[in-house]
């Protein structure tokens, strides 16, 4: 029985050239998180494995930093970074939970950042 829910930063915007923190938080379950995958559309950005720690995909190594917590920091943003991002929580015994974040990267300097929070 999957009782958990994923809270995300939702729809967020950021300035071109800047950075943004993508955060998801799994709540309302005692399930053990075995791994969190971060994906952009169908591209794997990073993995945080409970045993092995972080792995950043080679093609994103220069612009993606692990954390804070199970979140992901995107740096040197470009307009091409606009799109959907997914946090995929593999848990035991519940199974797989998926959260969605939409990021819009703006040319303007008046980009408003969405709410952010850190995993305790």
């Amino acid at each position: 029985m999957m009782t958990g829910t994923i809270e995300t930063t939702g729809n967020i915007s950021a300035e071109k050239g800047g950075s943004i923190i993508l955060q998801c938080h799994l709540s309302s379950t005692t399930a053990q998180v075995t791994q969190v995958n971060w994906e952009q559309q169908d591209q794997l950005l990073a993995i945080c494995n409970a045993d092995l720690g972080w792995h950043i995909s080679p093609s994103f190594k220069d612009r993606v930093a692990p954390g804070p917590g199970l979140g992901l920091t995107l740096q040197s943003l470009t307009v091409n970074d606009t799109g959907e991002y997914f946090c995929i929580y593999h848990t035991y015994p519940d199974g797989t939970y998926t959260g969605r974040i939409f990021l819009e990267v703006l040319e303007s300097s008046v980009a408003e950042h969405g709410a952010r929070f850190q995993i305790p």
Epitope: Q32, T34, I47, N49, L52, Y92, D94, G95, T96
Partner: antibody
Framework: EVMLVESGGGLVKPGGSLKLSCAAS????????MSWVRQTPEKRLEWAAT????????YYPDSVKGRFTISRDNAKNTLYLQMSSLRSEDTALYYC????????????WGQGTSVTVSS | DIQMNQSPSSLSASLGDTITITCHAS??????LNWYQQKPGNTPKLLIY???KLHTGVPSRFSGSGSGTGFTLTISSLQPEDIATYSC?????????FGGGTKLEIN
């Protein structure tokens, strides 16, 4: 080349024990989650146990919980399945399998070792 | 447990045909559905993961689709080497469960 070679299967009486081994080569064994999956005489596949790369976390279906223990020796590149209190319904071909790093699916399987539980 | 119902259980087709195998989950599994091929006397081989993603080295005549509870595996331009049993597996929740398999034969 990724290779997974199982051994240790055989004929055992109900209530008996058996320990299966899976020798891995061709990849960094400690970086991969591994599983045992069995195939019944009716050819249906059943997940039997999973262990994380470092060996710190193990997962089982209710049907084998408390009777089967999955473990690994990363220094020897070997995966194990200790089976006890065996039942006739445990009769199957047992495969060891490697999970994709994304943890979405099992990408390599061994050839399997046969376990028959019968009096 | 999530039940995976696969159909048909067996299928006979001719070389060059396009065939479709379906897998139905007893509850929503999003896109967490994998397809495996097992040739006679051989070990299972991953074909498709995450419902539609072709595993490395798998010919493009294989394709997968679906989400939620309904999924299909399609093999176009059937080849002799496609003779095998095909099984689906859900990765949405523990215990991971498999379909009963579809045995594909060539006419």
């Amino acid at each position: 080349e990724v290779m997974l070679v199982e051994s240790g299967g055989g004929l055992v009486k109900p209530g008996g024990s058996l320990k299966l081994s899976c020798a891995a080569s061709g990849f960094t064994f400690s970086s991969y989650t591994m599983s045992w999956v069995r195939q019944t005489p009716e050819k249906r596949l059943e997940w039997a146990a999973t262990i994380s790369g470092g060996g710190g976390n193990t997962y089982y279906p209710d049907s084998v919980k408390g009777r089967f223990t999955i473990s690994r020796d990363n220094a020897k590149n070997t995966l194990y399945l200790q089976m006890s209190s065996l039942r006739s319904e445990d009769t199957a071909l047992y495969y060891c399998a490697r999970w994709l790093p994304t943890y979405y699916a099992m990408d390599y399987w061994g050839q399997g070792t046969s376990v028959t539980v019968s009096s | 447990d999530i039940q995976m119902n696969q159909s048909p259980s067996s299928l006979s087709a001719s070389l060059g045909d396009t065939i479709t195998i379906t897998c139905h989950a007893s509850q929503n599994i999003n896109v967490w559905l994998n397809w495996y091929q097992q040739k006679p006397g051989n070990t299972p081989k991953l074909l498709i993961y995450k419902a539609s993603k072709l595993h490395t080295g798998v010919p493009s005549r294989f394709s997968g689709s679906g989400s939620g509870t309904g999924f299909t595996l399609t093999i176009s331009s059937l080849q002799p080497e496609d003779i095998a049993t095909y099984s689906c597996q859900q990765g949405q929740s523990y215990p991971y469960t498999f379909g009963g398999g579809t045995k594909l034969e060539i006419n």
